[in-house]
């Protein structure tokens, strides 16, 4: 009926997310009633995608409202008998249209899950489900495909026209004369044996029968329908009626008799009592998020989705939160780029997963003979003579600090430095003044001080 933001949930949003036109798809999945959601069971009872999908165009500044949904039914064919109790999963998917949509084209907006009890043949049940900020209004019902009847669609009912206790417009069933069929809404005159209808005033024919009222057998030999050629004198023989007469299995299904009834073995992609319902195949594009659709290997799985990195689920509908596994060590920030994971490391750490501690002496040597010294949560290198820098990889310039006093000239040397002193000075750093009378040298006064009477220093 409708899908949109729920009431009183903050700023209303549009399903189109203000990113231009979009389409909404609904994936309906039926699971057995005993199924636990946690055990990611398959849609064992059946699944289908909505087909009638209008384009919603959102105009900027327009207040968000629930989008009305078209009347297109989502038919979910179920196999075998109807269980009555089941889990109903409805996923609402948004396909963003337009070139400048930005972000992923497909998004799972909402997923509602709930257990239900429902007998086949009952009226439409209405429901409203809220999940997050979204609200979905929908109705659902279970119907048996003719000739199945009953709350579990487990009985086969063939209409009889004999008088019965059934009310007007209702006909009794074979082999259950006490069970009455639903009111006939088929086109008047539609063959009760070879025709059926889903909508009023229509008449659909079982395979092997044709005509507006399904009364004309399709000829496969000179003998009609299930009659077989007999001796020339007798023309055609009519064998006793059998459940597979006229082959009730559509779409190439093969019919086999089972205890007075029939069973159809359906080809891939078809389900239902008579293989009349087409199931989801790769042609329906069931794989989301760029998943590759290939054939399934079991008769009950027509397709398999091969998901791209970062997605999982039977339809690649679930984004794998690979960062939730916290692959980045030492407080690194995890970035899921889709095709790969990237870790942005904190200062002092490196490596694809920030596993290398740059502030740790373990496994990290100081170059050129330097030694690693830890302290205060950090590490530094004490470098050998002639080297410097964080890892002692830089060759030091020993003359950079002008170590030679009194105009001495500095020369870098492999073992350090050598000072060539100016006349009148001596010492490793030219720090001593030479006395002119040959007495011991005295430390020279710093430059800028006048040395009036050297002898007062003796």
């Amino acid at each position: 009926h409708s899908f949109g933001p729920g009431p009183g949930l903050g700023t209303p949003r549009s399903p189109c997310n203000a990113r231009g036109p979009c389409r909404l798809f609904f994936r309906v999945c039926l699971k057995p009633g005993v199924s636990q959601e946690a055990t990611e069971s398959l849609c064992a009872l059946g699944a289908a995608l909505s087909t009638s999908v209008p384009v919603y165009t959102e105009h900027p500044g327009e207040s968000a409202a629930a989008l009305p949904l078209p009347d297109g039914l989502v038919r979910v064919p179920f196999r075998d008998a109807w269980p009555g109790t089941f889990s109903l999963v409805i996923e609402t998917w948004r396909e963003q249209l337009g070139e400048h949509a930005g972000g992923p084209a497909w998004n799972l907006l909402a997923r509602v899950v709930g257990r239900r009890r429902l007998a086949a043949g009952g009226p439409w049940a209405r429901d409203v489900q809220r999940t997050g900020t979204w609200e979905l209004h929908f109705s659902y019902r279970a119907r048996c495909e003719p000739p199945a009847v009953g709350a579990a669609c487990a009985r086969l009912c063939r209409s009889r026209s004999a008088p019965s206790r059934c009310g007007p417009g209702l006909r009794p069933c074979t082999p259950f004369p006490d069970e009455c069929e639903a009111p006939s809404v088929c086109r008047p005159g539609c063959s009760p044996e070879h025709g059926y209808c889903e909508e009023p005033d229509e008449c659909r024919c079982l395979e092997g029968w044709t005509g507006p009222l399904c009364t004309v057998p399709v000829s496969t030999s000179s003998c009609l329908n299930s009659r077989v050629p007999g001796p020339a004198s007798t023309g055609c023989l009519l064998p006793g009626p059998g459940p597979c007469d006229g082959n009730p299995c559509a779409n190439g299904g093969s019919c086999s008799e089972t205890s007075g009834s029939f069973e159809c073995a359906c080809p891939r992609g078809f389900y239902g009592l008579r293989c009349e319902v087409s199931g989801v195949t790769c042609a329906d594009g069931p794989c989301f998020n760029g998943g590759l659709c290939v054939g399934g290997e079991d008769p009950d799985s027509a397709y398999v989705c091969h998901c791209p990195p970062g997605f999982q689920g039977s339809n690649c509908e679930k984004r794998v939160d690979r960062c939730s596994l916290q692959p980045c060590q030492n407080g690194g920030l995890c970035l899921d780029l889709g095709h790969a994971l990237r870790c942005r490391c904190r200062a002092g750490f490196a490596g694809p997963r920030c596993e290398h501690d740059l502030d740790d002496c373990a496994g990290r040597a100081c170059a050129n003979g330097g030694t690693c010294v830890e302290g205060g949560g950090s590490r530094r290198c004490s470098c050998a003579l002639g080297f410097g820098g964080r890892d002692c990889r830089e060759r030091a310039d020993p003359c950079a600090s002008r170590p030679c006093a009194h105009g001495g000239r500095c020369y870098a040397h492999f073992s350090g430095l050598v000072c060539a002193c100016a006349p009148g000075y001596m010492g490793v750093r030219c720090e001593f003044a030479v006395r002119p009378d040959g007495a011991d040298a005295v430390p020279a006064a710093p430059r800028g001080l006048r040395q009036a009477d050297p002898q007062r220093f003796l």
Partner: antibody, heavy 115, light 107 residues
Framework: EVQFQQSGPELVKPGASVKISCKAS????????IHWVRQSQGKSLEWIGL????????VYNQKFKSKATLTVDNSSTSAYMELRSLSSEDSAVYFC????????WGQGSTLIVSS | DIKMTQSPSSIYAFLGERVTITCKAS??????LSWFQQKPGKSPKTLIY???RLVGGVPSRFSGSGSGQDYSLTISSLEYEDVGDYYC?????????FGGGTKLEIK
């Protein structure tokens, strides 16, 4: 009757390429995956990959991604596997198959890589 | 990749004996498992799919069971024609992977 007819044995030199064919019959070709499987002498089976003729979808075993290229020709209902940069390690019997619930296999194509 | 560990690697049994071969998956494969029989010089033949469903035309003495990670193939009464190699295959997840095989011989 469903059948897969594979091409005959091949003797090739290291570094060369070879293309093995698999002609399918007896069913709707586009309905089912065609798988390729390798069996080295005295060894187990290894899944190389599959191709889905309906849409051309291909899934490779990463181990064989740079070794094998899978293709189909729907008009002739044939599948092909090209193997490149061959070495003696690639000497094996290669099968095409439908690995589904009915399970039909080709007779196998023997490849010998030798100088 | 899912690793399939098959055991035993070889088995000798008497005619009429009950024989069981097992396969263990490295993770849950949700019963997406097939069993194959291969006779010398021949192509493999599918016996079982979806862990326990018998392929048409396969004798009913073959049966499969198991769930989750553990699966087995049982021959209820061994016959001479059952001699050969047996393989399991998981098809729950790409890449599909086979077990290492079991050689079955008559005592």
């Amino acid at each position: 009757e469903v059948q897969f007819q594979q091409s005959g044995p091949e003797l090739v030199k290291p570094g060369a390429s070879v293309k093995i064919s698999c002609k399918a019959s007896g069913y709707t070709f586009t309905d089912y995956n065609i798988h390729w499987v390798r069996q080295s002498q005295g060894k187990s089976l290894e899944w190389i990959g599959l191709i889905y003729p309906f849409n051309g979808g291909i899934v490779y075993n990463q181990k064989f991604k740079s070794k094998a290229t899978l293709t189909v020709d729907n008009s002739s209902t044939s599948a092909y596997m090209e193997l490149r940069s061959l070495s003696s390690e690639d000497s094996a019997v290669y099968f095409c198959a439908r690995l589904n619930w009915e399970g039909y296999w080709g007779q196998g194509s023997t490849l010998i890589v030798s100088s | 990749d899912i690793k399939m560990t098959q055991s035993p690697s070889s088995i000798y049994a008497f005619l009429g004996e009950r024989v069981t071969i097992t396969c263990k998956a490295s993770q849950d494969i949700n019963s997406y498992l097939s069993w194959f029989q291969q006779k010398p010089g021949k192509s493999p033949k599918t016996l079982i799919y979806r862990a326990n469903r018998l392929v048409g035309g396969v004798p009913s003495r073959f049966s499969g069971s198991g769930s989750g990670q553990d699966y087995s193939l049982t021959i209820s009464s061994l016959e001479y024609e059952d001699v050969g190699d047996y393989y399991c295959l998981q098809y729950a997840e790409f890449p599909y992977t086979f077990g290492g095989g079991t050689k079955l011989e008559i005592k």
